[in-house]
Interface confidence: low
């Protein structure tokens, strides 16, 4: 698997992973104790025909071109967890691994 | 996990799995011996805020709203393989399990 990495200066128009720091304090998410911010990253860009397609299925749907199929879109294809310390609904402090919080790779699907 | 199933008569505008039969003969993919056609399905529809979101990350990116982030899109969240008999590049007949050929579930990511 392969994915492009870009930054805010990139001229790349295709599907790419961009840096994004999520700041829980800025969102007012005061139930999160730690981390207060983390590098989440996000996916953005065009999905031209066969570029970074994760699945052969994507190519086949493009060929068949059914009503309403919008073509592939740029979306996370590999994600990883982060460890978080937070209050749950019962005001208990929980330490846990929260899945799919960081985008490691972007692709077209 | 949960996903909607629709058909061509559905009035559902949200992210949904639709039936699609892929016909290899119609594509001129003559290197595929069997199956000649199979039920692939595809994803289509709107991803309104938090509907069928697969990852918490999707919600966070929506909150942070970075330059160029396009919002979640309707994409396969569960896929399965099919067994295929085909010619490889060396004209050898191969029987193998090809991953991610069938969409089992759609979601917003």
């Amino acid at each position: 698997d392969f994915g492009l990495d870009c930054d805010e200066h990139s001229t790349e128009s295709r599907c790419c992973r961009y840096p994004l720091t999520v700041d829980f304090e800025a969102f007012g998410w005061d139930w999160i104790i730690a981390p207060k911010r983390y590098k989440a990253n996000y996916c953005s860009g065009e999905c031209e025909f066969v570029f970074l397609q994760k699945y052969p299925h994507t190519h086949l749907v493009h060929q068949a071109n059914p009503r309403g199929s919008a073509g592939p879109c740029c979306t996370p294809t590999k994600m990883s967890p982060i460890n978080m310390l937070y209050f749950n609904g019962k005001e208990q402090i929980i330490y846990g691994k929260i899945p799919a919080m960081v985008v490691d790779r972007c692709g077209c699907s | 996990d949960f996903g909607l199933d629709c058909d061509e008569h559905s009035t559902e505008s949200r992210c949904c799995r639709y039936p699609l039969t892929v016909d290899f003969e119609a594509f001129g993919w003559d290197w595929i011996i069997a199956p000649k056609r199979y039920k692939a399905n595809y994803c289509s529809g709107e991803c309104e805020f938090v509907f069928l979101q697969k990852y918490p990350h999707t919600h966070l990116v929506h909150q942070a709203n970075p330059r160029g982030s396009a919002g979640p899109c309707c994409t396969p969240t569960k896929m399965s393989p099919i067994n295929m008999l085909y010619f490889n590049g060396k004209e050898q007949i191969i029987y193998g399990k090809i991953p991610a050929m069938v969409v089992d579930r759609c979601g917003c990511s």
Epitope: F2, L4, S10, T11, E12, S13, R14, E46, E48, F49, V50, F51, L52, Q53, H62, G71 | -
Partner: antibody, heavy 124, light 107 residues
Framework: QVQLVQSGAEVKKPGASVKVSCKAS????????MHWVRQAPGQGLEWMGN????????NYNQRFKARVTMTTDTSTSTAYMELRSLRSDDTAVYYC?????????????????WGQGTLVTVSS | DIQMTQSPSSLSASVGDRVTITCKAS??????LSWFQQKPGKAPKSLIY???RLVDGVPSKFSGSGSGTDFTLTISSLQPEDFATYYC?????????FGQGTKLEIK
């Protein structure tokens, strides 16, 4: 076979516009980016931009951005490049070129088919 | 924009010679470089992509090498039909930029 056939030579006055066409045949037009490249007489090649017929998304060289528009007509498998406010230094041969994408990496492509070129002469 | 500098700008050689044309990028472009051949009055023709991969149908006497900022095109044994102008192109980022060309002439 895959072919790109461009419109004929044009002579234009400074300040006018020109619209060059590039008709594709022998392949699925919507599936491949079309690029436009120009070449002034006796000079090198200059990339102008591209368009993806599948969704109409285009990328322009900043140098031309204010004056160029690339469009496609999928019903006729034709790409168009319009250049406005023509100047004498826009005199050039304009080429369309298909970007052939064979893989999944960002550089897994090349220009496999070119149009024959359209000479645009800007002269008062 | 990424600047592509080709050298030499012109080159005289004889049939049977081995010639090398170089292309230097103003910044790292990985292996995202193509080479073209152009004959007078004709459209360019792709020879090499991704720095060293030969386009289908192009004879193996053409070869490419390099990565990062320095690239070369080599023609191992010149034939009369090889006398033309050669261009490199970086496709690492927009705008795509070409070298200024190398004119290969018969000595």
């Amino acid at each position: 076979q895959v072919q790109l056939v461009q419109s004929g030579a044009e002579v234009k006055k400074p300040g006018a516009s020109v619209k060059v066409s590039c008709k594709a045949s022998g392949y699925s037009f919507t599936g491949y980016f079309m690029h436009w490249v120009r070449q002034a007489p006796g000079q090198g090649l200059e990339w102008m931009g591209n368009i993806y017929p599948y969704n109409g998304v285009s990328n322009y060289n900043q140098r031309f951005k204010a004056r160029v528009t690339m469009t496609t007509d999928t019903s006729t498998s034709t790409a168009y490049m319009e250049l406005r406010s023509l100047r004498s230094d826009d005199t050039a041969v304009y080429y369309c070129a298909r970007r052939y994408y064979y893989g999944t990496g960002p550089a897994d492509w090349y220009f496999d088919v070119w149009g024959q070129g359209t000479l645009v002469t800007v002269s008062s | 924009d990424i600047q592509m500098t080709q050298s030499p700008s012109s080159l005289s050689a004889s049939v049977g010679d081995r010639v090398t044309i170089t292309c230097k990028a103003s910044q790292d472009i990985n292996s995202y470089l193509s080479w073209f051949q152009q004959k007078p009055g004709k459209a360019p023709k792709s020879l090499i992509y991704r720095a060293n991969r030969l386009v289908d149908g192009v004879p193996s006497k053409f070869s490419g090498s390099g990565s990062g900022t320095d690239f070369t095109l080599t023609i191992s044994s010149l034939q009369p039909e090889d006398f033309a102008t050669y261009y490199c192109l970086q496709c690492d980022e927009f705008p795509l930029t070409f070298g200024q060309g190398t004119k290969l002439e018969i000595k």
